[in-house]
């Protein structure tokens, strides 16, 4: 890619809002947008909520003053709104816009998440940072769909199961799957929440070995691609704190059993490198299969210069570094 440093298009958001923390290109009806997450912004649509964050839409072409406007997600202004039988939401400092993803099709919808969203139903005992995601329609106007993938009725323990999962710290959208990283599940072993939009069910990660690896942060980064076959979608999750060096897993989304089945794993090389904290699935060699780039931003040979490891797909989920 060639970058043009001479004539950049420059969009600006509110001060101290972390405007630009997540950025996404979106198009709908011949209009191109840049969507920008500002996870520490105040929201004009929820003035009584403390810095919930916001997603801004910036029109790319006919927009001479480079104005960006906040998306209205129709989320109301109350603290303690019911979100289920044992669920009351607290949106203060929820970090809406921490991650953004787009469904890869003409009328693709947009996924926007707030990983610090909290369920305060049991606040006398536990405040549960489940995390929250919102599916925005392609036109960026109509009301969308709310997702709290970690909420389960009558479950109230912080740390245990999905109590503090913080879903949405990372997100990815395929045509049929909504993939949300949840690094706080199972005492921060982490997990990946995958919603199949075709039948509105979640695919489960039942791998005991992974679920018992506490404090590894699986789900800190997620992506998806064609790893086992050009026509199937597999899900990738990074666990940057695994054994201190970081790990990445690829899972097959098995529709029949409704589960995620591990088909590949790779580990980082250096302690503290945070290997797996960023991921990119891309076909580098044009063979129809996704290859994988894994970021390790704290990798240090000289001084925390970081490293990207490239894995080339040899077929059937066998990747070669």
């Amino acid at each position: 890619y060639n970058l043009d440093p001479q004539r950049p298009v420059h969009f600006q958001g509110p001060a101290d809002s972390f405007f630009g923390y997540a950025v996404l290109e979106h198009f709908h009806d011949n209009t191109r947008w840049v969507l920008v997450g500002a996870p520490k912004a105040d929201s004009k649509y929820s003035p009584s909520v403390k810095s919930p964050g916001a997603v801004f839409k910036c029109r790319v072409h006919t927009n001479p003053d480079r104005r960006c406007t906040e998306l209205d997600m129709a989320r109301g202004k109350n603290r303690g709104t019911s979100c289920g039988k044992t669920c009351r939401e607290d949106r203060d400092d929820e970090w809406m816009g921490v991650s953004l993803a787009r469904q890869p099709k003409a009328d693709g919808r947009v996924l926007a998440c707030a990983h610090r969203w909290k369920n305060i139903y049991y606040e006398a005992d536990h405040i549960l940072p489940h995390g929250f995601c919102y599916i925005i329609p392609s036109n960026l106007q109509a009301k969308g769909r709310t997702l709290i993938p970690c909420y389960e009725e009558y479950k109230k323990k912080y740390g245990e199961e999905h109590g503090s999962c913080q879903a949405g710290i990372a997100g990815f959208f395929t045509e049929e799957l909504v993939v949300m990283g949840a690094p706080g599940s199972f005492y921060w072993a982490g997990t990946i929440k995958v919603l199949n939009l075709t039948d509105n069910t979640y695919l489960k990660l039942n791998d005991e070995v992974i679920m018992n690896r506490r404090y590894t942060y699986l789900g800190y980064a997620v992506t998806a691609g064609h790893f086992s076959h050009p026509s199937t979608i597999d899900v990738v999750g990074g666990a940057p704190q695994d054994k201190g060096i970081g790990k990445v897993y690829i899972f097959r989304a098995d529709r029949r059993s409704g589960t995620l089945i591990k088909i590949f794993q790779a580990s980082g090389k250096k302690m503290g490198s945070y290997f797996g904290s960023s991921l990119c699935a891309v076909d580098l060699n044009g063979d129809g299969l996704s290859d994988l780039l894994v970021g390790a931003p704290m990798f240090s040979e000289i001084r925390d210069e970081g490293q990207v490891t490239v894995y080339i797909n040899r077929g059937n989920g066998a990747l070669e570094e």
Epitope: A74, R75, G76, T81, K143, L197, N200
Partner: antibody, heavy 120, light 107 residues
């Protein structure tokens, strides 16, 4: 444009059953829940139940359990309400409505209603 | 089941007058309340959801408020086209239940 088109009025005999339809346009019913609501002449609104068309899961008011069956056909973007063993108490207008998958939302679009008259 | 008690059952107001309709739930419904308007011979229409959020396209003279078990809807300046029956509905727990309705007429 979002629309819910309901089937025409029905005149049925006591003891018979009837199946009402609700066809959506302008949106995919798999992205919503479809609800059915009953309104007897000059009376209030009663929630019958709903369906998640993506997987067929249903919820009913216990009062209508056994009386009403809600189904959906995603290929035709249509939801159905089947009412059985009809009596004069079932004479009413039946509405379908959509509810976006939004936990603090409500029924934002309604069909025009289908009038069911039970009479011998 | 959660009971919704709506009052008054009917009222008449002059054009420009402020109208308030209230709804009481038999238990805390945590803002899970919607208000609907139904004109004679027509389907209900959503006015307010989440207790105080105005539905797109609804005139700003309509507003909702309340919390816990007590909720109300206000019409700031009654207009002839506001003649209708108004229903509240709780969406906190299944079965969802409606209030008995308030028939609003013009004086």
């Amino acid at each position: 444009e979002v629309q819910l088109q309901q089937s025409g009025a029905e005149l049925v005999k006591p003891g018979a059953s009837v199946k009402l339809s609700c066809t959506a346009s302008g949106f995919n019913i798999k992205d919503t829940y479809v609800h059915w609501v009953k309104q007897r002449p000059e009376q209030g609104l009663e929630w019958i139940g709903n369906i998640d068309p993506a997987n067929g899961n249903t919820k009913y008011d216990p009062k209508f359990q056994g009386k009403a069956t809600i189904t959906a056909d995603t290929s035709s973007n249509t939801a159905y309400l089947h009412l059985s063993s009809l009596t004069s108490e079932d004479t009413a207008v039946y509405y379908c409505a959509r509810w976006l998958r939004h936990f603090y939302y409500a029924m934002d679009y309604w069909g025009q209603g289908t009038s069911v008259t039970v009479s011998s | 089941d959660i009971q919704m008690t709506q009052s008054p059952a009917s009222l008449a107001a002059s054009v420009g007058e402020t109208v308030t309709i209230t709804c009481r739930a038999s238990e805390n419904i945590y803002y899970s309340l919607a208000w609907y308007q139904q004109k004679q011979g027509k389907s209900p229409q959503l006015l307010i959801y989440n207790a105080n959020s105005l539905e797109d396209g609804v005139p700003s003279r309509f507003s909702g408020s309340g919390s816990g078990t007590q909720y109300s809807m206000k019409i700031n300046s009654m207009q002839p086209e506001d003649t209708a029956t108004y229903f509240c509905k709780q969406a906190y727990d299944v079965p969802y239940t409606f209030g008995g309705g308030t028939k609003l007429e013009i004086k």
